[in-house]
Structures are given as structure tokens and as C-alpha cells.
């Protein structure tokens, strides 16, 4: 949940209590367990970023 007194995060981002700022939902592809990803429900689940095959 966003901290009291904080401006709402822009579209495509979500509040991170861990980092104390809005974070891009796009980064949940690489770091899906980040706290703010819970607020990115509109973003479809995605696997970890690919490495070399």
C-alpha cells in the first residue's frame, strides 16, 4: 500500500515500500518478487529474463 501523503504513482508504475518510491511495473519481468509487483496486477505474469540458451 502506498505511504500516506505520497502522490499516486503514474500509470504503469506502483509504489515500493522497500525502495520508498514508485517503480515501473515493466521491471517485474526481471524481478517478479519485488514488493511493488503486487500493485501491478494489470501486467501479465512473465518469466525471469532469458539468459543465454
Amino acid at each position: 500500500e502506498q505511504a500516506p501523503g505520497q502522490a499516486p504513482c503514474s500509470r504503469g508504475s506502483s509504489w515500493s515500500a522497500d525502495l520508498d518510491k514508485c517503480m515501473d511495473c515493466a521491471s517485474c519481468r526481471a524481478r517478479p518478487h519485488s514488493d511493488f509487483c503486487l500493485g501491478c496486477a494489470a501486467a501479465p505474469p512473465a518469466p525471469f529474463r532469458l539468459l543465454w540458451p
Partner: antibody, heavy 119, light 111 residues
Framework: EVKLGESGGGLVQPGGSMKLSCVAS????????MNWVRQSPEKGLEWVAE??????????HYAESAKGRFTISRDDSRSSVYLQMNNLRAEDTAIYYC??????????WGQGTSVTVSS | DIVLTQSPASLAVSLGQRATISCKAS??????????MQWYQQRPGQSPKLLIK???KLDSGVPARFSGSGSGTDFTLNIHPVEEEDTATYYC?????????FGGGTRLEIK
């Protein structure tokens, strides 16, 4: 204010070794992956190595050109990241930057440290 | 590895006009939702600086004169109106997979 200070560069002979250091401040270091990126006139900007978090068992990833020769490490207690470079070649001559990334973006860059490999 | 090809290699634009820089990837760097492409600015004698992330989102503090667009393999950086301080080299970078790669850069000169 985010600050990144690279050091350790200089002149080294081919086949030699060098250890670069980067001290960071102004952001939660333990929550960010850290990268080394280098820049040369010949190859432009080139990602070299990345180290992830303690919770990732400090997983490391390397460019093909760095595999087997370079080792990235970090000391969270000192908010520092290092690049040990062995068996250096002329083509490793570049400015080396450290840069934190949460996931995809290299959010900040230091001033860089210059490495010259020449006999 | 994903190859990023920037064009043009250099361009000169009159003060107040539009600068357009292209970056083409050798394979798609987009999902149905997001594109994993960034743009950086490097002024002469300085370190690179993040301008645009995820193809179109301005980093904090970046003037609205800068905009990014594109998806899949084709991406564009626009600067309008250009100012003297925009003299720099601009690089695209993908974060689709490892290794991260950068474009060769586009040098922008203001006439």
C-alpha cells in the same frame, strides 16, 4: 544524491592483471544489481558484467569477452563493487563505468576509470 | 546476441527543429505490454545518462522535449525543439536478455 566513484585504472601490460573498484552512495545499494560497462572508440559501449543480490546468491553474468578472465564481486557492507581483470588484452583498453540497475535500466553512471593495455 | 543498429550515425539539426534517431533490433524486445528498450545521452566529456526507459517513459528530470516510441524491433527517439545543450551522442540499449547490448550511437550536432 547518487554518487559512483570508480578507481583502479591505469596502464598495464598485455597479460597483466588489474582490479577496479566502485564505491556507491545515495541509493539502497543492497537492493540493486551492479554492472560494469566499458567504452572504447573501437567498440562503443559494451556491457561487461553484472552481479545480483545476496538473495540471488550473488549471481554473476558476463559478456563472452569477459568470461574466464574477469570476475565481478560486491561488498554490501562497503557499498562497493569490484572487477578483477586478468590476462588483459589490448582490446580491453577502455573507460570502465559502474552502474546500478534495479532490473532493466542503468540508472546512474560514475565518471569512469581508464584502463590502457599496452606494452 | 541482439544487435542494435542506430541511424543515422550523425546528424545536424537547426536550433528549435526536430531531431529523429532510429534504433532497429535484430529481434523483438517487446512483450504485449512493455518494450525493453532504453535511450541514453552522453554529452562530450561526460558519462552516459539515462533519458528514456521502456521505449517511451521519460526518466525523472528529463525535459518533455524528449520522447521515445516504438515496439518490437523498431524504436525512435525524438527531440523537439532541440536546444544547444542537446549536443551529444545518443545510444539505445535493450534489456530483453543477457547480454545487454547498445547501439553504435548517433552524434547530434546543433546548427
Amino acid at each position: 544524491e547518487v554518487k559512483l566513484g570508480e578507481s583502479g585504472g591505469g596502464l598495464v601490460q598485455p597479460g597483466g592483471s588489474m582490479k577496479l573498484s566502485c564505491v556507491a552512495s545515495g541509493f539502497p545499494f543492497t537492493k540493486y544489481w551492479m554492472n560494469w560497462v566499458r567504452q572504447s572508440p573501437e567498440k562503443g559501449l559494451e556491457w561487461v558484467a553484472e552481479i545480483r543480490l545476496k538473495s540471488d546468491n550473488y549471481a554473476t553474468h558476463y559478456a563472452e569477452s569477459a568470461k574466464g578472465r574477469f570476475t565481478i564481486s560486491r561488498d554490501d557492507s562497503r557499498s562497493s563493487v569490484y572487477l578483477q581483470m586478468n590476462n588483459l588484452r589490448a582490446e580491453d583498453t577502455a573507460i570502465y563505468y559502474c552502474s546500478p540497475t534495479y532490473a532493466d535500466t542503468m540508472d546512474y553512471w560514475g565518471q569512469g576509470t581508464s584502463v590502457t593495455v599496452s606494452s | 546476441d541482439i544487435v542494435l543498429t542506430q541511424s543515422p550515425a550523425s546528424l545536424a539539426v537547426s536550433l528549435g527543429q526536430r531531431a529523429t534517431i532510429s534504433c532497429k533490433a535484430s529481434q523483438s524486445v517487446s512483450t504485449s505490454t512493455y518494450s525493453y528498450m532504453q535511450w541514453y545521452q552522453q554529452r562530450p566529456g561526460q558519462s552516459p545518462k539515462l533519458l528514456i526507459k521502456y521505449a517511451s517513459k521519460l526518466d525523472s528530470g528529463v525535459p518533455a522535449r524528449f520522447s521515445g516510441s516504438g515496439s518490437g524491433t523498431d524504436f525512435t527517439l525524438n527531440i523537439h525543439p532541440v536546444e544547444e545543450e542537446d549536443t551529444a551522442t545518443y545510444y539505445c540499449q535493450h534489456s530483453w536478455e543477457l547480454p545487454y547490448t547498445f547501439g553504435g550511437g548517433t552524434r547530434l550536432e546543433i546548427k
